[in-house]
């Protein structure tokens, strides 16, 4: 008799999830020589332990603590780049600007990037059919709680000037409901962070508006200022040129506004 299985609204666990996490861990420790003390099998066991046999709407940050401990890693606190709804460009940027780091440049962020996972209460099975959707089902699901946990820790570690890349093509350039807006902004430490600098990335080639004047950016400025952190904002009118100039800062065309 086929066992009844809860149908969730979101996509199921990414296929070959255990193999992917393990392979990513091995690759990460190969690329980063000072993370070679990390035992990838232990990392996978801790990851698995956070959600296997647990109800996928009842996951807590506490469930991820063993994984957090194993993956403890500190990036230079003054070189942190946050992003919201513009992940690809943020990652392209840190691949060129090698001394800046997004969450996905750390071990735990790298392991989970673009993956989905969940289990089932009281069984050791991984659910490859469906997983809870944050909006339609529940917010305390394995994926959301993971990103909330690592994002909070990442923001708490930041110091000096913190940069955030925001998508100027979206109706809400700053979205209070995004991970950046709901978690990271509120976990920057005013005693360590002097300034949050927003980079608003323009989408259209002919778009010359000052998106730093957008009401949602003003809302971000207000939230940040109330937390005793300075705020600054820059328009990045030409993201392609912006990346090119990061690669080749000596290029004569890089003196003009990008």
């Amino acid at each position: 008799v086929p066992r009844w299985r809860q149908q969730w609204s979101g996509p199921g666990t990414t296929k070959r999830f255990p193999e992917t996490v393990l392979a990513r861990c091995v690759k990460y420790t190969e690329i980063h020589p000072e993370m070679r003390h990390v035992d990838c099998q232990s990392v996978w066991d801790a990851f698995k332990g956070a959600f296997i046999s647990k109800h996928p709407c009842n996951i807590t940050e506490e469930d991820y603590q063993p994984l957090m401990k194993l993956g403890t890693q500190t990036v230079p606190c003054n070189k942190i780049l946050l992003w919201s709804r513009i992940k690809d460009l943020a990652h392209q940027f840190t691949q060129v600007q090698r001394d800046m780091f997004t969450l996905e440049d750390t071990l735990l962020g790298y392991l989970a990037d673009d993956l989905t996972w969940c289990g089932e209460f009281n069984t050791s099975k991984i659910n490859y059919q469906s997983c809870p959707d944050w909006r339609k089902d529940c917010s305390n699901n394995p994926v959301s709680v993971f990103w909330k946990t690592v994002s909070r820790r990442f923001a708490e570690a930041a110091c000096d000037v913190v940069h955030v890349m925001l998508n100027g093509s979206r109706s809400k350039i700053f979205d209070k409901n995004s991970t950046f807006g709901s978690v990271e902004v509120h976990n920057l430490q005013p005693e360590k962070v002097q300034t949050l600098e927003a980079w608003v990335i323009h989408g259209g080639r002919e778009d010359s508006r000052d998106l730093c004047q957008d009401p949602t950016i003003k809302e971000l400025e207000s939230i940040i200022s109330k937390r005793n952190i300075q705020f600054s904002c820059k328009n990045i009118y030409r993201p392609d040129k912006f990346l090119q100039c990061v690669k080749n800062p000596e290029d004569s065309s890089c003196t003009s506004e990008i």
Epitope: K27, H32, P33, E34, H37, Q73, T74, R98
Partner: antibody
Framework: QVQLVQSGAEVVKPGASVKVSCKAS????????MHWVKEAPGQGLEWIGY????????NYNQKFQGRATLTADTSASTAYMELSSLRSEDTAVYFC?????????????WGQGTLVTVSS | DIVLTQSPATLSLSPGERATISCRAS??????????MHWYQQKPGQPPRLLIY???SRATGIPARFSGSGSGTDFTLTISPLEPEDFAVYYC?????????FGGGTKLEIK
Amino acid sequence: QVQLVQSGAEVVKPGASVKVSCKASGYTFTSYAMHWVKEAPGQGLEWIGYIYPGQGGTNYNQKFQGRATLTADTSASTAYMELSSLRSEDTAVYFCARTGGLRRAYFTYWGQGTLVTVSS
Amino acid sequence: DIVLTQSPATLSLSPGERATISCRASQSVSSYGQGFMHWYQQKPGQPPRLLIYGASSRATGIPARFSGSGSGTDFTLTISPLEPEDFAVYYCQQNKEDPWTFGGGTKLEIK
């Protein structure tokens, strides 16, 4: 600025142990791994291993595994290397060294070195 | 372990000349588009000093006369023109695999 200050020279007997310290300043001690490197007379440089003070993780060169013990006191921002069962070939200058961290795993900062002489 | 073989062991040159030091690895030390090879200079009684990282990038404060090249198993450190303060011992070092290993060193001496 980043500074790594090591303990003074030691003369020890064969079979004994020695513990060399490396006091770090000018940066967040728990954020970077601390490495140890051996320079024996006329022998060049040899990597012993590292400790990641933030999590206590260690990684040893198999050649030194079992005889070298790397520890850290985060409250004192000090790393230690203890070498046991000393023999004459352990006579060397021992350096602590720090890298630039994530994506910059090469030795940017060095201690001044500690000469350990094993002699009866 | 990855063995790094430096040549020559000793190099005798005059200031103003070009020094070329080779470092050959027993297996590739390049991976994922990165070169896990670094170069250091050491003078008597001092710790080593980082010159080149990632095979070809100059460390902060290192003059342009120092350059690094190579990939896979063959790497080169070039110093041109030589200045009097450049006479020292030079080491290559890899961290592609554990244990991290150093070359045997090249002594650059004044002719």
